[in-house]
């Protein structure tokens, strides 16, 4: 394993006041998967609701790099390649678990966190609100 | 904190052979306070590439229930509400982290695992392969 020198300001798991703390093996099962979504498929370009992928990097988080989708248009691309504003491009969101260093910069101490990420976009029929 | 008696069959974090292991505070912090992903949408029904959500359940994993999207059609829904097979409904996949007890039933020892889930579907222009 990797040994990292203990920072005296970082929490000690033996400390009774430290919240419910466990050991987590970071030797991830299923490493073979490809984390860059651009490499896995070109759906982001071929979709009728295309999106750009933005790199969200945070060294205090694990995983440190998360790719966030941003829909390119408010509308969707029609058969002629033009944007049709009668339809809407919307992000599909997913809640994911990440680990955040807590306190910051402590190599061996993390907190479990849930964050919301946009994975891609889909084209939907808009909800029309009828005025009474 | 909660103190749990150590099971002699569970790994010792001091063990030099134990893989890269960190302390994690499992009191989950939820950053999504204003954006509840569950509330977020009925896009699965309104999309031109609609999908059904299937339950993937594993009691030895956290989260125990993960919803998998399955596209309803091979094609996409056109303006008339019919399936257009000149376009393709495809799943958007996301790699997520889950926690698994390892060894099983050891209260203070977990392993991170990456799994690939389908979050929703999008409508794409098919790739046409021209025969030489």
């Amino acid at each position: 394993g990797i040994t990292i020198p203990r920072n005296p300001g970082c929490p000690n798991s033996e400390d009774k006041n430290f919240p419910r703390t466990v050991m987590v093996n970071l030797n991830i099962h299923n490493r073979n998967t490809n984390t860059n979504p651009k490499r896995s498929s070109d759906y982001y370009n071929r979709s009728t609701s295309p999106w750009n992928l933005h790199r969200n990097e945070d060294p205090e988080r694990y995983p440190s790099v998360i790719w966030e989708a941003q829909c390119r248009h408010l509308g969707c691309i029609n058969a002629d390649g033009n944007v049709d504003y009668h339809m809407n491009s919307v992000p599909i969101q997913q809640e994911i678990l990440v680990l955040r260093r807590e306190p910051p910069h402590c190599p061996n101490s993390f907190r479990l966190e849930k964050i919301l990420v946009s994975v891609g976009c889909t084209c939907v029929t808009p909800i029309v609100h009828h005025v009474q | 904190g909660i103190t749990i008696p150590r099971n002699p069959g569970c790994p010792n974090s001091e063990d030099k052979n134990f893989p890269r292991t960190v302390m994690v505070n499992l009191n989950i912090h939820n950053r999504n306070t204003n954006t509840n992903p569950k509330r977020s949408s009925d896009y699965y029904n309104r999309s031109t590439s609609p999908w059904n959500l299937h339950r993937n359940e594993d009691p030895e994993r956290y989260p125990s229930v993960i919803w998998e999207a399955q596209c309803r059609h091979l094609g996409c829904i056109n303006a008339d509400g019919n399936v257009d097979y000149h376009m393709n409904s495809v799943p958007i996949q996301q790699e997520i982290l889950v926690l698994r007890r390892e060894p099983p039933h050891c209260p203070n020892s977990f392993r991170l695992e990456k799994i690939l889930v389908s979050v929703g579907c999008t409508c794409v222009t098919p790739i046409v392969h021209h025969v030489q």
Epitope: - | K38, Y62, S64, H105
Partner: antibody
Framework: QVQLVQSGAEVKKPGSSVKVSCKAS????????ISWVRQAPGQGLEWMGS????????NYAQKFQGRVTITADESTSTAYMELSSLRSEDTAVYYC??????????WGQGTLVTVSS | DIQMTQSPSSVSASVGDRVTITCRAS??????LNWYQQKPGKAPKLLIY???SLQSGVPSRFSGSGSGTDFTLTISSLQPEDFATYYC????????FGQGTKVEIK
Amino acid sequence: QVQLVQSGAEVKKPGSSVKVSCKASGGTFSSYAISWVRQAPGQGLEWMGSIIPWFGTTNYAQKFQGRVTITADESTSTAYMELSSLRSEDTAVYYCARDSEYYFDHWGQGTLVTVSS
Amino acid sequence: DIQMTQSPSSVSASVGDRVTITCRASQGISNWLNWYQQKPGKAPKLLIYAASSLQSGVPSRFSGSGSGTDFTLTISSLQPEDFATYYCQQYSDDPTFGQGTKVEIK
């Protein structure tokens, strides 16, 4: 098959506290949450809060915040719900339920708590 | 909190009847809606989760539909053991239940 077995009926005085237990038999808690739901006589169901025993993470309904404490002891696969400052309107059947964070699929048999002077 | 409103509050029906119960959410909850059956003196039992998925072991005469704010539980052919109170519950946010619909013998 997961079974949730709750402690017996309680009669309490106003202002006191009650602690109800819920033991998971036929398996560990696994990674699910345990929620507590109550039902006053002849009334509907009201969610009080939950705990993920694996983690010790709790979530309470705003109405009960500060008055309810949910804990879990993994070594005995038992969850507890303690309600303090009891008043007559807390008279209800209290249920524990296995909670996937999407639905409640297994329920305890219920514990009747009567608050009376 | 998200309010859940069920209608009707009670319904009288005979064995073999088709029974429909509706549930309306005060705001959009996507498909995060469940239906439970409760008999007197017993704990609730999960029938339908995620608006339309039948929980294992539940007879196929029970079905659920809807999305957003309006949902329906249908019992296609009422059986003697179906006389009970039915509750809808949202889990889009902290869980809340409808006030219940009692299905009684006509």
